[in-house]
């Protein structure tokens, strides 16, 4: 049977003696990942002390002894007697210190120290010679061991191949003993025949003890590069993978640790483990309960899965996501949680594993550790959550996670804040429960504060602004959120983000947020006072010019600038101005910026969404008589009449409303003709509905919250922010849907149809529009 001493070779092998365990993992020759030993975290001490900074004398203790030790008084005679004894025994004290083995047994030598725990000066001076002597003895022993092993190895190799399993067992035990000594260990690893025999014996034996000894021997060899190479060349990897099926814990532990060392330090080992079916075996072992064993197993999985799609799919097929999530839910051992979170991080950039992790409850399980004192664990959980978050918008039971993420926005760690903002951005997309939850736990204030603190760090401001954009539309607390941004002094910084040095993705998000904030009448004046309107117009002009320039150069393809199409900016700015134009003072500013010619020009855009927002803003501006006249003077009647026939209901309705407002001062017969035109074009399918409005009494007054059509199949934009420590250049899902109606089936909110006052039944008669009429601003996009 295995002795306790044998078992103590394994840090994991259930031993109570923790010091022994630690010393094993900290052997200098042991090539481990540092998972358990932390061996790579400090420089080795040259003095042999644990920490060169620490003196090995406890000063307080010395002072205490100083005071205590001499409280006793001596007579002159006693002092003289003691002096005499010391003088007579000086040579013996030196000999005792230098060559203790030469002393006669039982001989008493008076010590010059009161406290036996402290060495005498002579003993201290003797330390170097003692060390030298030990070094010489060790060298002799090493040479003896090496010589003995060299002679023994050929015979032991034969015995390992013996027909008699009893002999094989004895040989295995002996080889294992030899492998514990450094010299003989080197001799073993330098014998390919011996290593092959060990490997063969290990996988062929039915004897538990033989399996344990051979696996233990390979484990001892794996602490050296030469040993790793010998194991690899001898076909040790398939044999060790086979041993992962052993019912004996010690064999299992030896096998997994040896494989771990191979994976870390031996070229070609990863491929060999994959080919031997190691991934399936390792995933099957995740139901074990020894935390140190699990830590090594999960680290092996991480090494194998990193940068290898096939491995990720094998882990998925073997039930890995569920098992890994269970570990995150069940255990508290930091190293295990950290290694498991690393595997999940690698898997979280795989489109097949992502939904499996989410469905296994991965979001909630990872969320449990976001307040852990271990920063490396928190960071891994956050990276993984961010990667998963775009696939988790339909998850239930996210309250705890959302609350923690809002708290983490207040962290001093920039990486933590970046991730928390990104996750909140995705989780608040198209999920009204999550939106309400975040609002209820102070998310608006936290996000505004985050944007204020972030300055021009766009990796924080962009996701934070996106999250605010989602929180300010399409849920019961949206109006509260729109007010809260203002009440927490967010409007100045939001408007500031429209200006340089902001890049297009951030500008796009900010424009969408401003559009949503403008839905709240209380924000109209502050946004105007902060100069939002001139900047939106400036951005609109610039983006429009850019699209025009490309068109004139014969380009039909929409081009991206920093990942944003300029058409999206045109659409966004126009849409924001449309909502801001609900306020009479804002309309004056908008008109004063000479925007009407541009809005009329946008009616000719080939993109329906741009047609719709352009018609929408003109509809608002046309409430004012001078503006209506200016619109007509710009020649808007022709394009508006054309748009009456648009298959996009929003476009047609806005066009009708502008034409109707432009006709306010026209003669009655003109109005009649217009009425017929509007009737025939707007109510092709339900002519009765128009008649019910009676004489076109369209009282287009103040705008309510626009009607919206919703679909429920969100598609997300994933974006790079390099260096997240992910698998290769895995995409980092941060953003929501793209703008515009360019992704059919996505959840795009409708930016709104005009509130036709008492003619609301006209609107009710409209069939639902297609996804192309939906705008991005409110982007839950």
């Amino acid at each position: 049977m295995a002795t306790q001493a044998d078992l103590m070779e394994l840090d994991m092998a259930m031993e109570p003696d923790r010091k022994a365990a630690v010393s094993h993992w900290q052997q200098q020759s042991y090539l481990d990942s540092g998972i358990h030993s932390g061996a790579t975290t400090t420089a080795p001490s040259l003095s042999g002390k644990g920490n060169p900074e620490e003196e090995d004398v406890d000063t307080s203790q010395v002072l205490y002894e100083w005071e205590q030790g001499f409280s006793q008084s001596f007579t002159q005679e006693q002092v003289a007697d003691i002096d005499g004894q010391y003088a007579m025994t000086r040579a013996q004290r030196v000999r005792a210190a230098m060559f203790p083995e030469t002393l006669d047994e039982g001989m008493q030598i008076p010590s010059t120290q009161f406290d036996a725990a402290h060495p005498t000066n002579v003993q201290r001076l003797a330390e170097p010679s003692q060390m030298l002597k030990h070094a010489v003895v060790n060298l002799i022993n090493y040479q003896d061991d090496a010589e003995l092993a060299t002679r023994a190895i050929p015979e032991l190799t034969k015995l390992l191949n013996d027909e008699d399993q009893v002999v094989v067992n004895k040989a295995a035990v002996m080889v294992h003993q030899l492998s514990k000594k450094e010299a003989s260990r080197h001799a073993i690893m330098r014998s390919p025949q011996m290593v092959s025999a060990i490997v063969r014996t290990m996988q062929n034996t039915n004897d538990v003890e033989t399996a344990r000894c051979t696996a233990g021997t390979l484990h001892n060899l794996s602490h050296h590069r030469e040993g790793l190479l010998a194991i690899f060349k001898s076909g040790g990897i398939p044999a060790l993978v086979k041993m992962l099926g052993s019912p004996v814990d010690s064999v299992l532990f030896y096998a997994i640790t040896t494989l771990h060392n191979l994976l870390l330090h031996q070229e070609g080992a990863k491929m060999a483990v994959r080919l031997a079916g190691g991934l399936q075996k390792m995933v099957a072992l995740l139901n074990k309960t020894n935390v140190k064993f699990l830590a090594i197993t999960t680290d092996c999985l991480q090494i194998l899965a990193y940068g290898n799609q096939e491995s990720k799919l094998i882990i998925l097929a073997s039930g890995g996501p569920q098992a890994l999530v269970n570990i995150m839910r069940t255990y508290t051992y930091e190293k295990l949680l950290w290694t498991t979170s690393r595997v999940l991080k690698v898997l979280s950039v795989c489109s097949s594993n992502k939904p499996a992790i989410v469905e296994a409850g991965g979001m909630q399980a990872l969320g449990l550790h976001l307040t852990d004192p271990s920063q490396r664990l928190v960071q891994n959980c956050l990276w993984t959550l961010r990667n998963l978050s775009d696939a988790a918008t339909k998850q239930e039971g996210m309250e705890g996670l959302l609350g923690t993420l809002v708290q983490l926005l207040g962290s001093d760690d920039i990486n933590v804040v970046t991730c928390a903002a990104g996750i909140l951005s995705n989780l608040t997309c198209n999920n009204y429960k999550n939106k309400m939850m975040v609002c209820q736990v102070g998310g608006i204030e936290a996000l505004v504060r985050t944007v204020l603190r972030a300055g021009d760090r766009e990796d924080i401001t962009e996701p934070a602004i996106c999250a605010l954009r989602h929180l300010t539309s399409r849920h019961q607390e949206a109006e509260m959120a729109q007010n809260a941004v203002r009440l927490h002094y967010g409007l100045p910084v939001v408007v500031k983000l429209l200006h340089p040095p902001s890049h297009w993705p951030l500008i796009k998000a900010t424009v969408g947020l401003i559009r949503n904030l403008a839905l709240c009448p209380a924000n109209h004046a502050p946004l105007r006072e902060q100069g939002a309107i001139p900047r939106l117009v400036q951005l609109l002009v610039r983006a429009h010019q850019d699209t025009q320039r490309r068109t004139s150069m014969g380009g039909t393809q929409q081009q991206f600038v920093e990942g944003v199409r300029m058409e999206e900016i045109v659409e966004g700015c126009t849409g924001a101005l449309h909502i801001l134009a609900r306020d009479v003072h804002n309309r004056i500013v908008i008109r004063g910026l000479n925007t009407i010619p541009l809005f009329v020009q946008l009616l000719y855009s080939p993109i329906e969404n741009i047609q719709r927002v352009a018609a929408g803003v003109l509809c608002e501006l046309a409430q004012d008589k001078e503006a209506a006249e200016a619109i007509e003077a710009e020649g808007a009647t022709a394009p508006l009449t054309e748009l009456l026939h648009s298959r996009n209901e929003g476009v047609a309705t806005y066009a009708a409303a502008v034409l109707f407002r432009m006709s306010e001062d026209k003669p009655q017969d003109y109005k009649k003709r217009l009425s017929v035109e509007l009737t025939s074009s707007l109510f092709r399918t339900e002519p009765m509905a128009w008649n019910e409005t009676a004489d076109l009494g369209l009282d287009i007054g103040a705008q309510g919250e626009p009607l919206g059509y919703r679909q429920d199949d969100p598609s997300y934009r994933s974006f790079h922010s390099g260096g997240y420590g992910q698998d290769a250049l895995g995409m980092d899902p941060m953003m929501e849907h793209e703008m515009g109606g360019h992704h059919p089936g996505a959840d795009y909110p409708v930016d709104g149809l005009p509130d036709l006052g008492h003619a609301q039944d006209l609107m009710d008669g409209l069939p639902p529009g297609d996804s192309n009429q939906l705008a991005w601003f409110d982007t839950d996009l």
């Epitope: 003995l148 002679r151 190895i153 050929p154 015979e155 008699d164 009893v166 040989a171 035990v173 002996m174």
Partner: nanobody, 118 residues
Framework: QVQLVQSGGGLVQPGGSLRLSCAAS????????MGWYRQGPGKQREFVAS???????NYAASVKGRFTISRDNAKNTVNLQMNSLRPEDTDVYYC????????????WGQGTQVTVSS
């Protein structure tokens, strides 16, 4: 130097019994295995049975249930009691002592003919 002296063997009818003995002399280490092997003309030497210093016995599948191995550590002897003998058990039987010294050593007896025939 270790010496192994075998005794027993001979001719026996199928179904009969025989007892082989082997005595070891010389400098024998305590950590050892004593066993029996057999070899026919032109054939490879084949393991039959063995026993450790702690009396752990091991048998080849072909003889299990028919042969019994035993040893006397004080006298450094090993015995093989062979029952229900079959014609295919006909071979030269060799005693072997494997000492787990450093390096290990293997010593062989001189061999004993066993013939099972009617």
């Amino acid at each position: 130097q270790v010496q192994l002296v075998q005794s027993g063997g001979g001719l026996v009818q199928p179904g009969g019994s025989l007892r082989l003995s082997c005595a070891a002399s010389g400098s024998i280490s305590s950590n050892n295995v004593m066993g029996w092997y057999r070899q026919g003309p032109g054939k490879q030497r084949e393991f039959v049975a063995s026993i450790t210093d702690s009396d752990l016995a091991n048998y080849a599948a072909s003889v299990k249930g028919r042969f019994t191995i035993s040893r006397d550590n004080a006298k450094n002897t090993v015995n093989l009691q062979m029952n229900s003998l079959r014609p295919e058990d006909t071979d030269v039987y060799y005693c072997r002592l494997t000492m787990m010294t450093a390096p290990p050593t293997i010593s062989w007896g001189q061999g004993t003919q066993v013939t099972v025939s009617s």
